[in-house]
Interface confidence: medium
């Protein structure tokens, strides 16, 4: 069944954007204009979830590849990962749970909120290329994101 | 208040095919997806499968050849066509409602139609 | 072909806790849901995305999930909670139920 699905860059507050560094790894850093084009491109799925006002359940692949971000428990800890997919079975309506997040918008910012851990956001670093993680919105890192659409 | 109002032939001959057809009153067609349940005298349900206002579909793997789900988006209302049935077939059939805000699982269901398969 | 495995049958006495169990491989992976069968009905969505309750449904009904098992509890179990229950879950591009439990409220 066709998924609906939307193509966004993200940045973070603080305008830093998000590339790929490794096969799967997400860093976010300062671009200017020549290397712009190096940011991510997401693929935003409207996914299995409970939407309410504020929330919208979504998942997150990178937009080319057969990668999305998922949410797994690491040595005790929520941690975001990228995740290789089959192309033939993703993107789906009914994401097992640790690829979805409740996208929360806070006046004309975003939130990431993972589905399997509750409270746990996609979150940056105040300093400069370090790794996209998943946070629980504490001391200095940054989890509100501006989304710039892509047309497909 | 969402209400799902089914019909069909209740008594088939082994080899007919099975149709039946659920109309939905109250509510936005278009926002949901559309399903086929069968439960057989005293067991356990099974999906057969769903459709969306776009005809867009997915099935049973196991009932996939003989099955077809269509959508008619005018009057509202949505049809099950199984080929070539069997006493197996034999069962109550349900339509219902996948709605998004319940994680698109099955939150209204129909009356349910008894279909008997018998020579 | 996906397989969720239920009790056949579990009994509780009245005001005591029931447990209903659904297991399947990596179930906790996935969303799971319930419903509610009493004999001559149509089935009523009980317990949505693992724990979620509809309304109208009664707080002593909650669910969990994890690992390969989801359970439906239902606390200080009433007569009227007599039925069948099944839990059903996302098979890559099919829905499966489980085979069904039917609980009993004895006396």
């Known amino acids: 069944v066709p998924i609906r699905q939307l193509h966004y860059r993200l940045r973070d507050e603080q305008q830093k954007s998000l590339v790929l560094s490794d096969p799967y790894e997400l860093k976010a850093l300062h671009l200017n204009g020549q290397n712009i084009n190096q940011q991510v491109i997401f693929s935003m799925s409207f996914v299995q979830g409970e939407p309410s006002n504020d929330k919208i359940p979504v998942a997150l692949g990178l937009k080319g590849k057969n990668l999305y971000l998922s949410c797994v428990m690491k040595d005790g800890t929520p941690t975001l990962q990228l995740e290789s997919v089959d192309p033939k079975q993703y993107p789906k309506k009914k994401m097992e749970k640790r690829f979805v997040f409740n996208k929360i918008e806070v006046k004309s910012k975003v939130e990431f909120e993972s589905a399997e851990f509750p409270n746990w956001y996609i979150s940056t670093s105040q300093a400069e290329h370090k790794p996209v993680f998943l946070g629980n919105n504490s001391g200095q890192d940054i989890i509100d994101f501006t989304m710039e659409s892509v047309s497909s | 208040q969402v209400q799902l109002q089914q019909w069909g032939a209740g008594l088939l001959k082994p080899s007919e095919t099975l149709s039946l057809t659920c109309a939905v009153y109250g509510g936005s067609f278009s926002d949901y997806y559309w399903s086929w349940i069968r439960q057989p005298p005293g067991k356990g349900l099974e999906w057969i499968g769903e459709?969306?206002?776009?005809?867009?579909?997915n099935y049973n793997p196991s009932l996939k050849s003989r099955v077809t789900i269509s959508v008619d988006t005018s009057r509202n209302q949505f049809s099950l066509s199984l080929s070539s049935v069997t006493a197996a077939d034999t069962a109550v059939y349900y339509c219902a409602r996948a709605s998004p805000s319940s994680g698109w699982t099955l939150d209204y269901w129909g009356q349910g139609t008894l279909v008997t398969v018998s020579s | 072909q996906s397989v969720l495995t239920q009790p056949p049958s579990v009994s509780v006495s009245p005001g005591q806790t029931a447990s209903i169990t659904c297991s399947g491989d990596?179930?906790?992976?996935?969303?799971a849901f319930w419903y509610q069968q009493k004999p001559g009905q149509s089935p009523v969505l009980v317990i949505y995305l693992d724990n979620k309750r509809p309304s109208g449904i009664p707080e002593r009904f909650s669910g969990s999930n994890s690992g390969n098992t989801a359970t439906l509890t239902i606390s200080g179990t009433q007569a009227l909670d007599e039925a069948d229950y099944y839990c059903q879950a996302w098979a890559d591009s099919f829905e499966v139920f489980g085979g069904g439990t039917k609980l009993t409220v004895l006396g």
């Open positions: 459709i969306d206002h776009s005809g867009s579909t």
């Open positions: 990596k179930l906790g992976d996935k969303f």
